[in-house]
Interface confidence: low
């Protein structure tokens, strides 16, 4: 008799794929455009990335450091009107892209939550949640919550409003903290909160360190659904050298939780390569004309257009990973088991019941390594086969689809492998 199927967990929309942050509309659209109407024209591009949600803004009225001149219910006219916003929402819904609105109050000022009048600001946020929920948004983001006194209790209250309206609405909080205890204390009192932080931002050094960070986090958060990113707002290139971008894309898409990216992460957008561009929000490189300031500074392979035409590009990898992440049960909600694979390597299995299983092996080092996969670390339910099919490598040159002997696995410097193998009773 066939074993009984495991009951599927309840899946919210943000469990099914990545979120894509557009914190600066003008930088994202470039060419002095940067309004809600223009963003509507970019939704097809977001669809092509297979992202599930767009984290937008802040776009509300905010006069730097002035509580009285900050109105969370009004869209800054530079970005467009409420009608433009409604129209964007409708178009996004048709394309199955959810819209999350960033309500970080003083986004133009020095302290995102102002340095006084906490209660006034908190009341404004409360009113804004109710207003924008009625307007049809799918969720909210608030950043820099380490600047908010009594953040936990405010977040709990805002979560109640959001979830009270519908279980299908999401609240994201962002912090610059990388301190696990502080992160856990924020999560403790807020059951369904999705928290983005800088927890992984110093993980670029070794596979062992990354493994320990990831496993510590997952052990500490238990059965909670979590998110994976390197910060609450910034680009991957702020933290990672170019050679680790592919590795991190593979990791963020295959860890259990919601991957969260910033616009440009999919092409390796790097402010440092664009003189005069702000680190936090460089102009998005749609094509070579996107950054006319310095002729020749932008080559085709740095742009969306150029990378779209190259199956070996970072953008192509992003699209493939996003696609896998959104349709494979083991990646959608499968169990996670990390195990030893040798110094410099981080490896883990994702599996769900009798579905196809995935093995991820990541070489963070700058030397080629033979992987000694220690299957003894794994529970019986997640045992390793002798061979697995190579679904993709972060480096070109591998014959994808071919079976690899796991005992003889050798990885190139900074290479990540995604392998798949069937369930065996």
């Amino acid at each position: 008799r066939a074993p009984r199927c495991r009951e599927l967990p309840a899946q919210k929309w943000w469990h099914t794929g990545a979120l894509y942050r557009i914190g600066d509309l003008q930088a994202f659209q470039g060419h002095g455009a940067g309004n809600l109407a223009g963003l509507k024209g970019r939704l097809d591009y977001l669809s092509s990335l297979k992202v599930k949600g767009l984290v937008l803004g802040p776009i509300h009225k905010n006069q730097k450091d002035d509580v009285a001149q900050t109105d969370l219910l009004q869209i800054d006219p530079n970005f467009g009107s409420k009608e433009d916003f409604d129209s964007l929402l409708q178009s996004a819904k048709k394309k199955s892209i959810r819209v999350i609105l960033d309500l970080t109050p003083n986004y133009r000022g020095e302290n995102s939550w102002f340095s006084t009048q906490v209660d006034t600001v908190a009341t404004k946020v409360k009113d804004a949640l109710e207003f924008w929920l009625q307007a049809g948004v799918d969720g909210f983001q608030v950043r820099d919550i380490e600047n908010l006194k009594d953040a936990s209790s405010f977040l709990a209250e805002w979560q109640n409003i959001t979830k009270g309206f519908s279980e299908d609405r999401l609240l994201i909080a962002g912090t610059n903290s990388s301190d696990l205890q502080q992160i856990l204390s924020l999560l403790e009192s807020n059951k369904d909160l999705l928290l983005t932080s800088s927890y992984l931002s110093d993980s670029g050094s070794t596979g062992e360190h990354t493994k320990s960070l990831v496993t510590q986090y997952l052990n500490a958060t238990g059965n909670r659904w979590c998110s994976w990113s390197l910060s609450q707002a910034r680009l991957l290139t702020s933290f990672l050298p170019a050679q680790l971008l592919r590795l991190y894309q593979l990791m963020l898409f295959t860890l259990p939780g919601t991957p969260v990216f910033s616009y440009g992460d999919e092409i390796g957008l790097d402010a440092a390569a664009l003189p005069g561009q702000p680190m936090e929000a460089p102009v998005m490189l749609w094509d070579e004309s996107s950054f006319p300031d310095i002729p020749g500074a932008v080559s085709a392979n740095m742009t969306v257009k150029g990378q779209s035409e190259d199956p070996g590009s970072l953008l192509s990898l992003f699209r493939r990973l996003s696609d896998q992440r959104s349709k494979e049960r083991s990646l959608l909600h499968g169990d996670f088991h990390a195990f030893s694979a040798g110094p410099g390597l981080f490896s883990y299995i994702r599996h769900w019941d009798q579905n196809e299983r995935f093995l991820v092996v990541l070489n963070f080092g700058d030397v080629g390594l033979s992987a000694g996969l220690q299957a003894s670390d794994l529970p019986a339910s997640a045992s390793l086969p002798a061979k697995a099919d190579l679904l993709l490598s972060t480096q070109p040159g591998r014959e994808e689809g071919s079976p690899l002997e796991l005992e003889r696995l050798k990885l190139e410097p900074h290479e990540g492998l995604l392998l798949r193998f069937p369930y065996a009773a």
């Epitope: 302290n111 340095s115 006084t116 600047n147 006194k149 009594d150 610059n176 502080q182 800088s198």
Partner: antibody, heavy 126, light 107 residues
């Protein structure tokens, strides 16, 4: 005016304990954090830890764990640093300090220590 | 823990000169760095926070810059009262850590 008033100098014997106090005036410690910083003779500054008096949560530098205990009494607007099993290595000036924003002072990651006590000198000697 | 390294223990300068003190963090700390001045027998005083923001009442000859791992504190024209020890400190992640200090002396 914001002030942090620290208790007077202490001369203590090795192996003993000492409890230093830091009383705030001009603001309520509930609205901020109180940090403790150590400075050995002719040496630099070392962060010991901090307390959030609103809930008693304390963070220590791991090297002071077991040596230092930070507490607060909100009714007297005072924070304390207790040092145990003293040795000559603990001879130092101990400062209490708090972040400069007092109304929204949970800015653990952004703001420096704007308010400092005058320091309490602790000498460990037999 | 994040290690803050001030490469110079001492720096000699003349009155009126421009002087820069550097500080390097062992890992990225965004802009979460403060600079303090300490004169003999006194408590430290906060001069700069968040890498480049001048604290209340601090003269504008004192400036700070940097982000990530490299930070610089500059006095545009050194006055006699500026002779002191200067410390950098990261306030990004606990435990907060200080640099070893740089003593500014007159040539």
């Amino acid at each position: 005016e914001v002030q942090l008033l620290q208790s007077g100098a202490e001369l203590v014997k090795p192996g003993a304990s000492v409890k230093l106090s830091c009383t705030a005036s001009g603001f309520n410690i509930l609205d901020t954090y109180i940090h403790w910083v150590m400075q050995r003779p002719e040496q630099g500054l070392e962060w010991i830890g901090r307390i959030d008096p609103a809930n008693g949560h304390v963070k220590y530098d791991p090297k002071f764990q077991g040596k230092a205990t930070i507490t607060a009494d909100t009714s007297s607007n005072t924070a304390y640093l207790q040092l145990s099993s003293l040795t000559s290595e603990d001879t130092a000036v101990y400062y209490c300090a708090s972040p400069f924003t007092t109304v929204v002072a949970t800015n653990i990651y952004y703001y420096g220590l704007g308010y400092w006590g005058h320091g309490t000198s602790v000498t460990v000697s037999s | 823990d994040i290690v803050m390294t001030q490469s110079h223990k001492f720096m000699s300068t003349s009155l009126g000169d421009r002087v820069s003190i550097t500080c390097k963090a062992s890992q990225g700390v965004f802009t979460a760095v403060a600079w303090y001045q300490q004169k003999p027998g006194q408590s430290p005083k906060l001069l700069i926070y968040s890498a480049s923001y001048r604290y209340t009442g601090v003269p504008d000859r004192f400036t700070g810059s940097g982000s990530g791992t490299d930070f610089t504190f500059t006095i545009s024209s050194v006055q006699a009262e500026d002779l002191a020890v200067y410390y950098c400190q990261q306030h990004y992640s606990t435990p907060w850590t200080f640099g070893g200090g740089t003593k500014l002396e007159i040539k």
